[in-house]
Structures are given as C-alpha cells and as structure tokens.
C-alpha cells in the first residue's frame, strides 16, 4: 500500500469539534489544518481528545509556532498543556493570570512540577516582576509554588507582597530563596510589635543571620524546634548556650531529640560540655572542660 | 454486519511461538485501530497493544513488549498477533477488538484459546 | 499505568431493581471510559463508550456517568439476560487498562 498523507475527502476537517475524536492520529495529522486548529483553539478543551491525540494537536501547534505559541492560543491550551515539556515553555511570553490559572489547574494531579516551574517563571518574566496579583493567584491555585522561583525571581518581589505569603507557601523553599525573601519579610514587618512580628516573621527565619537571631533570643519569643531546625547552620552555631535557652524558652527540651541533627549537633560541638550540662537535657558531644579553643580562622585573618 | 473473525484454537508446547488471526468483514481495517486483548480464565482483561494497519504504526503494553509482535495486511483486511516464547503464563483467550481513534474497542472477536502444554 | 479499580467484585440484585456499578480512575482520565459485559462463555461486547455515550443497539437502561476518576455503570429494571461480568476501560492513556471486572448475579 502507498503511504496517504492526504486527507480523504469524507475527512475533511472545517471545525474543530466533537467528530475529530474518532479520528485516528495519522488522520488526525492528515486532515486538520494548524491554522485552523489555533484559531478554534478555545473549542479544543471541550473535546476529550486521548492523550495520543493531544500528541498530533501539539505537533500541528509546534510546526505553526515554531519560536513559541502566542498567548492566545497558551490561554487555552487546556488538557494540551500535559504535553508541554519545560523547553517549549521557556519560548512562551506569558502576561495573563488567567492564563496562569487555567494552566495551573489542569495540571493539578499530574508530575508537572518543572513545567509548573517553568510556566511561573514565564510570568513573571512577562508581568516584570513577582508582583502581588501573581503572588495571590501561586497562594491560590499552587500552594508551594513560589519556591519553584530562582533567588534572581525572586529577588524582584516588592516587600509589600511579602504580607500575602502563608507559611505553607514557603514550605518547599530552599535556603538560597529564603535568603532573598528573608530581608524582604524583616522590611514588610518592621513596624509589627514583638510577639505579632515573630509570628510573621517565623516561615522566612530560614534566610535569617545571626544577628537577628540573636535579637530574637532577647524577645521571649518561644521558638518552637522545628523552625530553629530550620535556621541557617551559620546564624546558630555562633549562639551561646544561653541564647538557645532565652529563643527556645520551653521547648529547650527538644534539643535532646534532634541532637544527632543538624545544625544542633554542629552547634553542641562548638559549646563547652559544662555549658550544656546547665541545660540538664544530657546533651553530650561538647568541648570538654579545661580544653583551650584556637579559632585559625582569625589568626589566619590577622596575618 | 461487523464481524471479526478470529483463527481457532491453539495447543503449543514451550518455547515455541503462535500466530493468531482476525480477519474483518463489512468494514475495512484501514479505517480503524485493531487492538488484541488477553484474559486468561477466571481473570480480568489485559490490552496487549494495538495497529494502524494504515501505516502500521504500532503501540505495545509495557508487559508485552518482546512477547508479541502484531501486525496487519489491508490485503485480506486481516489483523495478526504473534507470541513467541511461549510459557504457560500465556495459556489464555486472546481477542481482537476494532476501534476508532478514541482508543475504545467498539467490536470484539470470538476469541481464540491459546493452550501452552508440553 | 493507570489503575482502574471496581471495588466491588459481586452485586447481587433481582429483576426489575436499579444498580450501579463504579469504577475509579487513579488519575483524570476525562471521559475516555468504556463499559463492557461479557456473559459466561461469551466475548466482550461494548456499552458505553466516552463516559456516557451508548452504543447502537445498546438497551436504554444501561446509562454510563461520570468523568475525570469516578465512573458510574448503572442498569435500570435489571433482566435476567444482564447476568455478566462488567469491565470498565481506560483509553485516556497508553496502555490502555481495564477495570478487575464486577460480577452481576441474579437473585
């Protein structure tokens, strides 16, 4: 048999609809037109193409755009957009939020995170910034999904957005990201009174310094463990025995528990063994009474 | 009236391969996806994988990629399943199904009864 | 691969009686869901395709229902000759999955 690329006459498409579900993949690619296809493309996520379909449909797409699709023709991708590798995303100039949430919704419940990733990025690439719309719309419909930002992303968020990020939000962050967002955060929250300011201020402590840290320890703020385990390593390893007493307040107690974890452990080797045994927690592992501590670094520093 | 028409039944000793066949009438194949099914007794169905006998563009289940080979000749409207390295985990009915590009399988064959016995 | 589960392997029901026979979806599979029945010693015959749509010269008291992970088979005024197994398919994805079946018997 000769291979038919042509599309039989009882085939032929001029509308996208319903019918074109019965269609076969090489009929499919035969029979409908990429132009038609981009101006119908609002009717396309109302049919239940096959995921195999969707293969043909974005191929057609691709052929007709091949610098990136226009947001016209993103804003109802629908279904389609589970094709979407991150490379083809990265040639998209997304500005619509709706865009964003049709998008975000349809990938919910699928292993979208890169694509996901890559989409956000887009928008804020084509809005200008990390704006507090965009910020709303990632809390709404992708809770987590501004740590998926890169610290250069996120460095373009103004610190009156910082108000409308929830904990939640930040839980998937690394100490890269928390580091951009945490100055922003002290900034939005400077004028909050102690206790108020600590509760804020609490999900971004991840990118705090020392320095603050220590302040904090001065606020009987109560640190609960989890967020001191999640303290840079660098802000608590220079606290003293006592500064960890006056941040943690009652939950000292759960050092016990994570002293094999970083950064306790880090932080019990550079105490001295009886100013932890003030503590009455056992914690074992400090610099054993009488021992002489030479910090190189400094000497190294001086010469 | 659609009918798919598949070869009769099979008794085969291990290690050995079989070729099934179902032929279409009243509709030609060119036009549709055909799909082979497995049910071996007292169980569910397995979709093995499916042909465009247009082009002959296959796909295949996971599970039976290198276990069967289906092919199509437009010529005799004929579809074919072949299963070679035969155990009897492959003792089972075999059917064919047509269907369009949804993906569905809208008409079935009779079956055909694969025995693997030595 | 996408799982489809019919958690109910056995319905029993009398002539006349409605029943309804799920099927779920490990993930959103749209509407690409067929229903089949097979009676004893017979090949698969197909009911419903695309959710909802039944074939020519299916009754009308199969109706099929749903879409996204939960799927719905329900027969209405039960005959004796509906005593088969019922399978639902997935065709959203390759490969293509089948429900474990649910048997219908007959009071």
């Known amino acids: 048999d000769v291979e038919r690329t042509t599309c039989p006459p009882e085939k032929e498409v001029h509308e996208i609809d319903e019918s074109l579900i019965f269609y076969k993949k090489r009929e499919l690619e035969a029979c409908v037109d990429a132009a038609l296809l981009a101006a119908q493309m609002d009717r396309v996520d109302a049919i239940p193409f096959t995921y195999e379909q969707l293969d043909v449909l974005k191929h057609k797409l691709d052929e007709l755009y091949p610098q990136g699709y226009p947001e016209s023709v993103i804003r109802h991708l629908g279904h389609l957009f589970l094709k979407m590798s991150p490379e083809d995303i990265r040639k998209w100039n997304v500005t619509s939020l709706e865009t964003l949430k049709a998008l975000l919704k349809v990938s919910k419940g699928h292993e979208m995170s890169a694509q996901v990733a890559t989409l956000i990025d887009r928008v804020v690439v084509g809005r200008g910034q990390l704006d507090k719309d965009t910020v709303d719309t990632l809390t709404a419909f992708c809770p987590g999904c501004l740590c998926s930002l890169s610290p250069e992303r996120l460095s373009s968020v103004p610190p009156s957005v910082i108000g409308a990020v929830r904990p939640q939000d930040l839980d998937t962050c690394g100490p890269r990201q928390l580091d951009v967002l945490y100055p922003k955060a002290r900034l939005a929250f400077q004028n909050m009174s102690g206790s108020e300011y600590f509760v804020k201020i609490r999900p971004f402590l991840g990118g705090a310094p020392t320095e603050d840290v220590k302040a904090l320890s001065q606020q009987n703020v109560s640190m609960d463990l989890a967020t001191f385990m999640k303290l840079r390593r660098e802000a608590v390893l220079p606290l003293t025995v006592a500064e960890v007493q006056k941040l943690l307040g009652p939950h000292v107690e759960g050092l016990k528990v994570e002293e094999q974890h970083s950064p306790v452990r880090d932080w019990i080797l550079k105490q001295r063994q009886d100013d932890l045994d003030t503590l009455g927690l056992g914690l074992q592992g400090g610099i054993p009474n009488g021992y002489l501590i030479l910090d190189l670094s400094v000497r190294e520093a001086l010469s | 009236e659609v009918q798919l028409q598949q070869s009769g039944a099979e008794l085969v000793k291990p290690g050995a391969s079989v070729k099934l066949s179902c032929t279409a009438s009243?509709?030609?194949?060119?036009?549709?996806?055909m799909h082979w099914v497995k049910q071996r007794t007292e169980q569910g169905l397995e979709w093995i994988g499916r042909i465009d006998p247009e082009d002959g563009e296959t796909k295949y289940a996971p599970k039976f990629q290198g276990k069967a080979t289906i092919t199509a000749d437009t010529s005799s409207n004929t579809a074919y399943l072949q299963l070679s390295s035969l155990t009897s985990e492959d003792t089972a009915v075999y059917y064919c199904?047509?269907?369009?590009?949804?993906?569905?399988?809208?008409?079935w064959g009779q079956g055909t009864s694969v025995t693997v016995s030595s | 691969d996408i799982v489809m589960t019919q958690s109910q392997k056995f319905m029993s029901t009398s002539v006349g009686d409605r029943v309804s026979i799920t099927c779920k979806a490990s993930q959103n599979v749209r509407t690409a869901v067929g229903w089949y029945q097979q009676k004893p010693g017979q090949s698969p015959k197909a009911l419903i395709y695309?959710?909802?749509n039944r074939h020519t010269g299916v009754p009308d008291r199969f109706t099929g229902s749903g879409s996204g992970t939960d799927f719905t088979l329900t027969i209405s005024n039960v005959q004796s000759e509906d005593l088969a197994d019922y399978f639902c398919?997935?065709?959203?994805?390759?490969?293509?999955?089948f429900g474990g079946g649910t048997k219908l018997v007959i009071k």
């Open positions: 695309l959710a909802s």
């Open positions: 009243a509709f030609n194949i060119k036009d549709y996806y």
């Open positions: 398919l997935q065709h959203w994805n390759s490969p293509y999955t």
């Open positions: 199904a047509s269907g369009s590009g949804t993906g569905a399988m809208d008409y």
